[in-house]
Interface confidence: low
């Protein structure tokens, strides 16, 4: 069968493969065509980095599927992960590493299960399937690690009309995340939302815990007037 391999520059190559071919075999075919050493290739399909020993059929890669090829940087790059206790961890990563990969590296170093990790960069919570490059995380960037509370907590958001919305959140959620949850529930674009707690307008990049917002706290939602 034929599959396609697309590069970051948009170039596409066509490969003749079998479902039983291993990822290693596919990398060898790419080397034959393009001269790229297999150890510098990373193949991505459906947001997952493909492992050498597995087969195309293991990943449900069918005819005319498109894989994405990114290159492994020689030596990669270093990023820093800072915890709420102030401890800083140094990780060797590559731009093509997924957030999932980064959490696995943190688990290797610190023993924290990935499902209890939340990584924050530039005020945004990072999603498992995305890569560091998706978030423009470059060498020597600092990510912030906060721990996911099991079960999280409920808070209430009260509108000027008196309606109360209940949200499932965690202390590590950013105000941006909360606005996104409100958008999911109510359809109000985040840029039109203003959240108030204890008389203070809450800033997007900060977390609920920054404002000491605890379980069953009530936030007030006011709408930002267009043009205002």
């Amino acid at each position: 069968m034929q599959i396609f391999v697309k590069t970051l520059t948009g170039k596409t190559i066509t490969l003749e493969v079998e479902p039983s071919d291993t990822i290693e075999n596919v990398k060898a075919k790419i080397q034959d065509k393009e001269g790229i050493p297999p150890d510098q290739q990373r193949l991505i399909f459906a947001g997952k980095q493909l492992e050498d020993g597995r087969t195309l059929s293991d990943y449900n890669i069918q005819k005319e599927s498109t894989l994405h090829l990114v290159l492994r940087l020689r030596g990669g790059m270093q990023i820093f992960v800072k915890t709420l206790t102030g401890k800083t961890i140094t990780l060797e990563v590559e731009p093509s590493d997924t957030i999932e990969n980064v959490k696995a590296k943190i688990q290797d170093k610190e023993g924290i299960p990935p499902d209890q990790q939340r990584l924050i960069f530039a005020g945004k919570q990072l999603e498992d399937g995305r890569t560091l490059s998706d978030y423009n995380i470059q060498k020597e960037s600092t990510l912030h690690l906060v721990l996911r509370l099991r079960g999280g907590m409920q808070i209430f958001v009260k509108t000027l009309t008196g309606k109360t919305i209940t949200l499932e959140v965690e202390p590590s959620d950013t105000i941006e995340n909360v606005k996104a949850k409100i958008q999911d529930k109510e359809g109000i674009p985040p840029d039109q939302q203003r959240l108030i707690f204890a008389g203070k307008q809450l800033e997007d990049g900060r977390t609920l815990s920054d404002y000491n917002i605890q379980k069953e706290s009530t936030l007030h939602l006011v709408l930002r007037l267009r043009g205002g």
Epitope: G10, D32, E34, G35
Partner: antibody, heavy 122, light 107 residues
């Protein structure tokens, strides 16, 4: 349509500095690579420097290392070559080119600018 | 650095001739060799990459081949617009290096 346009060349004295620009359109330089290649009058092609914004990776020919700096402003989709401590032997037409092969170590070059002449002379 | 030794440095040919230019790499470069055409006062144009892959929009009279560390550019039937200088380049490792060029002139 992919286009590369160089600017910033001119006459400079030995020891002087120049900054060349390479404005790209039709593709995103962040996900590509930009390279400077020069050609001395009547001579062949010589690679000078490369930048891969996605990787934060740069590399230089030994002949310019420590004197030239390649950089990119992805918001402007433009790459730059800062040339310091210029010598007579740096006199050449400087081309910027896009990397075609994705092998980051050394690609082929599929699109080239029109070139900008740098003359180093007293 | 990998040296690319190109030959001949110049050749004279007529329209319709078959022309062959060779390039030898000083060490293995796999199939990572490109060929360019350059006309006076103009930027080079990519013809072939990865030894034998024809770049998009390039006429099929141009072809490339590899035998170990020897690479060949062939123009099957020379056209008037093909009179130019041709360069090979290895795109296997940094620094990318070019051959010294072959000038194809009208006989």
């Amino acid at each position: 349509e992919v286009q590369l346009v160089e600017s910033g060349g001119g006459l400079v004295q030995p020891g002087g500095s120049l900054r060349l620009s390479c404005a790209a359109s039709g593709f995103n330089i962040y996900y590509s690579s930009i390279h400077w290649v020069r050609q001395a009058p009547g001579k062949g092609l010589e690679w000078v420097a490369s930048i891969y914004p996605y990787y934060g990776y740069t590399s230089y020919a030994d002949s310019v290392k420590g004197r030239f700096t390649i950089s990119a402003d992805t918001s402007k989709n433009t790459a730059y070559l800062q040339m310091n401590s210029l010598r007579a032997e740096d006199t050449a037409v400087y081309y910027c080119a896009r990397g075609y092969s994705w092998y980051y170590g050394s690609p082929a070059f599929d699109y080239w600018g029109q070139g900008t002449l740098v003359t180093v002379s007293s | 650095d990998i040296q690319m030794t190109q030959s001949p440095s110049s050749l004279s040919a007529s329209v319709g001739d078959r022309v062959t230019i060779t390039c030898r790499a000083s060490q293995s470069v796999s199939s990572a060799v490109a060929w360019y055409q350059q006309k006076p006062g103009k930027a080079p144009k990519l013809l072939i990459y990865s030894a034998s892959s024809l770049y998009s929009g390039v006429p099929s009279r141009f072809s490339g081949s590899r035998s170990g560390t020897d690479f060949t550019l062939t123009i099957s039937s020379l056209q008037p617009e093909d009179f130019a200088t041709y360069y090979c380049q290895q795109h296997y490792t940094t620094p990318p290096t070019f051959g010294q060029g072959t000038k194809v002139e009208i006989k």
